[in-house]
């Protein structure tokens, strides 16, 4: 921001009013007027240049310094060209100089040169010619010096002429402020420029009305410099939560709008599903039946548990069943749905039922399920299964309903027996087969069915209580088809797949494990 | 209106003394440079004597350095000239005039102006 | 003797221009006034400054410098314009504080 400058001497503006000491009196410096636009226009000048040993002064009344450290003089003047004068006038002089004297009380007409410390000689960058004087083109020069720290309660200017050819048509001192400033949403004071030029005053801001310093922010701070420019803006205050920014202030939320936490952006509007908030609110209420879950950010419409699974099916296959649903018709308005499956295993003798978890192997963990589908196996035959899929989302856990579907399957057969070839030679096959132990207790007898790769007019089946059978009396280097079904009580169970298993050749006779 | 009005001239002779004054109103006498021109009889104008405006300093003419006095009474408004050891020479109609900024002029008010003869 | 030097007398025609002239080293430094005197009054300042008239002074009357010299001119010239005109200046050898022409007699024919 601009410096601003608080005027404590000026000149030109005071209309000749001012009756400055001159010394000596009348002969050197003198008041003169000029009428330009029909306004009057003063200026102190003094030409006598011809006379050699001048020492002219002019000096200004007392200036009370007030709070001014450092004070600005802005000197705007001509000079004229000692060419101007015959011979160039030995003793012309193209320069004048500036002094100040610091002093607590005014010293009235009582001028006293020692009393005086000089500032600078005050050269101009143009000299007035004899014919642009003439022709009423002065050559008006502008220059600015600086005198501080200042000390006393107030001060005197003054000019000495040496024998130069000068108007003097304004004087203006200064000094400067950093302005009143608005800023990060901070106020920044007006303050008084310091008067060392390396130094920055560190001046503290204050948050505007409803702003807030952000947590772990840096509290607002500017400098003010000399020259009453504010410089190196540090930290910031945002708006608190249920306010926004509005050019320079923080004003509450419209109704319908909120804002959740001190921060840079707007007031959002209410999302869906919630009610119309007051004015400056930091959040929206949830309808009823919509809830908000405690990590849902404000701007989240509000949701609703899930409706129930859609289309579940289960399709038995031996003593596994493939559970399969399709997403509820109403997700809540959520996509962290999530699904759990639940057993419960019924004897159709007695219709005594209980929780089947412990004996029941899931495809995978069946709490927290993101697929729309889990394998169950080890699933007892003859037993009635009912299973239960619920779905869930991150608001299910406010409300005391549940959402879900069941679907009931009986296991008529055991598992499919998985088979494996222990061993062969040139004309036989060593094969075993296991099954869930819970289903063990079931079979009667396991029938073992083996055929030639290829021909499907023949095949031979050997029946055992055991769970291995060595197939005797095959053709060497042949495949066989060989399958094994478990025989229960109430009639047969699943069949495993069919393996191809392929005895020896001749060359390489020998029984073999694999 | 902004006027000058002087009175106290006369004749006196050779050696004697007379006082001018010259009574302002209508500005604000204490913020002005006061003077004094004189005419002699068929001449021109000469340039007497300054006096600033609290009273503080005061330049003469050559001719009249030493004999003459100028003063002024603010609070009375009215501006004076003591005149001691006249000679014949300073027989003329003495103006006050008003110097209109600083010092040295322009003179914008005159008075109607006084007749001083010196003769025995 | 008078430091700035004035033409003791000028005549003109009623409605015609002249121009009276002021001789001095002091207006090299220093700008001219002039005054005008009609017998029996007062005088009365006509032109100070750069060409500055005072309220009340027709405009028929205006100053000029070039130099050493510094002129009024009377542009159609009317017959209470005659009377004895004086030019004034700072002293810029600091001898005296300020100092007049000798004056000048326009005379309107």
């Known amino acids: 921001a601009q410096g601003k400058e608080v005027v404590l001497l000026d000149f030109a503006a005071a209309g000749g009013e001012l009756g400055w000491l001159t010394h000596p009196y009348g002969k050197g410096w003198d008041l003169m007027q000029n009428i330009m636009n029909d306004m009057p226009i003063y200026m102190y000048s003094v030409c006598n240049v011809m006379s050699g040993d001048q020492d002219n002064w002019l000096r200004t009344n007392w200036v009370y310094r007030g709070e001014a450290e450092r004070i600005f003089i802005e000197l705007k003047f001509t000079v004229r060209d000692c060419n101007s004068f015959p011979g160039g006038a030995s003793s012309c002089k193209e320069t004048f100089n500036l002094y100040y004297a610091e002093s607590d009380l005014d010293y009235g007409t009582n001028f006293q040169k020692r009393l005086f410390t000089k500032i600078d000689t005050i050269a101009p960058d143009e000299i007035t010619v004899s014919s642009d004087f003439e022709a009423r083109h002065v050559k008006l020069n502008v220059e600015e010096r600086s005198v501080g720290p200042l000390t006393r309660k107030g001060f005197y200017l003054a000019f000495q002429d040496i024998g130069a050819c000068v108007a003097l048509l304004s004087v203006r001192v200064y000094y400067k402020k950093c302005p009143e400033l608005l800023q990060g949403l901070a106020h920044f004071p007006e303050t008084i420029a310091g008067s060392d030029a390396p130094s920055l005053a560190t001046v503290a801001g204050t948050c505007v009305d409803h702003a807030v310093v952000p947590p772990g922010g840096e509290e607002p701070r500017m400098h003010c410099a000399v020259d009453g420019e504010w410089l190196v803006p540090i930290g910031q205050c945002l708006c608190q939560a249920g306010y926004e920014k509005v050019e320079d202030a923080c004003q509450a939320c419209s109704p319908g709008f909120f804002k959740f936490e001190a921060s840079e952006s707007p007031c959002l509007e209410c999302p869906e599903h919630t009610l119309p908030s007051p004015e400056g609110a930091t959040s929206c209420e949830c309808e009823e039946g919509f809830f908000r879950a405690p990590q849902d950010p404000a701007s989240m419409p509000c949701t609703r548990p899930p409706s129930a699974p859609h289309y579940l099916t289960a399709v038995g296959m031996g003593a596994k069943v493939e559970l399969r649903w399709t997403p509820p018709q109403d997700s809540g308005g959520r996509e962290d749905i999530v699904y759990s499956v639940t057993c419960e295993q019924c004897w159709p003798e007695s219709g005594e039922c209980g929780p089947c978890e412990a004996s029941v192997r899931y495809s995978e963990p069946p709490h927290g399920l993101t697929r729309t589908s889990v394998t169950v196996s080890d699933l007892e035959p003859h037993m009635n299964y009912t299973f239960t899929v619920e779905a869930r989302n991150g608001v299910s856990g406010l409300v005391t309903s549940r959402s879900f579907r069941t679907a009931s399957v009986s296991i008529n057969q055991t598992e499919p027996p998985k088979v494996r070839l222990e061993g062969r030679s040139t004309t036989s096959l060593s094969v075993s087969w296991s099954i869930p132990p819970p289903q063990q207790s079931r079979v009667w007898k396991y029938e073992v069915t083996y055929r030639k790769k290829g021909d499907s007019n023949s095949y031979n089946v050997r029946r055992t209580e055991g769970f291995s059978v060595t197939l005797d009396d095959l053709a060497p280097d042949t495949t066989y088809l060989v399958q094994v079904q478990a025989l229960t009580q109430e009639g047969q169970g699943a069949g495993s797949k069919v393996h191809e298993f392929q005895t020896l050749s001749p060359e390489g006779s020998g029984n073999l494990a694999v | 209106q902004v006027q000058l009005v002087q009175s106290g001239g006369g004749l006196v002779q050779p050696g004697g003394s007379l006082r001018l004054s010259c009574a302002a109103s209508?500005?604000?006498?204490?913020?002005?440079?006061m003077h004094w021109v004189r005419q002699a009889p068929g001449k021109g104008l000469e340039w007497v004597s300054v006096?600033?405006?609290?009273?503080?300093?005061?330049y003469y003419a050559d001719s009249v350095k030493g004999r003459f006095t100028i003063s002024r009474d603010n609070s009375k408004n009215t501006l004076y000239l003591q005149m001691n050891s006249l000679r014949a020479e300073d027989t003329a109609v003495y103006y006050c005039?008003?110097?209109?900024?600083?010092?040295?002029?322009?003179?914008?008010?005159w008075g109607q102006g006084t007749l001083v003869t010196v003769s025995s | 003797s008078s430091e700035l030097t004035q033409p003791p007398s000028v005549s003109v025609a009623p409605g015609q221009t002249v121009t009276i002239t002021c001789q001095g080293d002091?207006?090299?430094?220093?700008?001219a006034s002039w005054y005008q005197q009609k017998p029996g009054t007062a005088p009365k300042l006509l032109i100070y400054?750069?060409?500055n008239r005072p309220s009340g002074v027709p405009d028929r009357f205006s100053g000029s410098s070039s130099g050493t010299s510094a002129s009024l001119t009377i542009t159609g010239a009317q017959a209470e314009d005659e009377a004895d005109y004086y030019c004034?200046?700072?002293?810029?050898?600091?001898?005296?504080?300020?100092?007049f022409g000798g004056g000048t007699k326009l005379t309107v024919l």
């Open positions: 002091s207006l090299r430094s220093y700008y």
């Open positions: 005039a008003r110097a209109s900024v600083g010092a040295t002029g322009p003179f914008d008010i």
């Open positions: 400054g750069e060409n």
């Open positions: 006096i600033s405006p609290a009273g503080t300093n005061t």
């Open positions: 004034n200046s700072r002293d810029s050898s600091g001898t005296h504080l300020t100092v």
């Open positions: 209508g500005f604000t006498f204490s913020s002005y440079a």
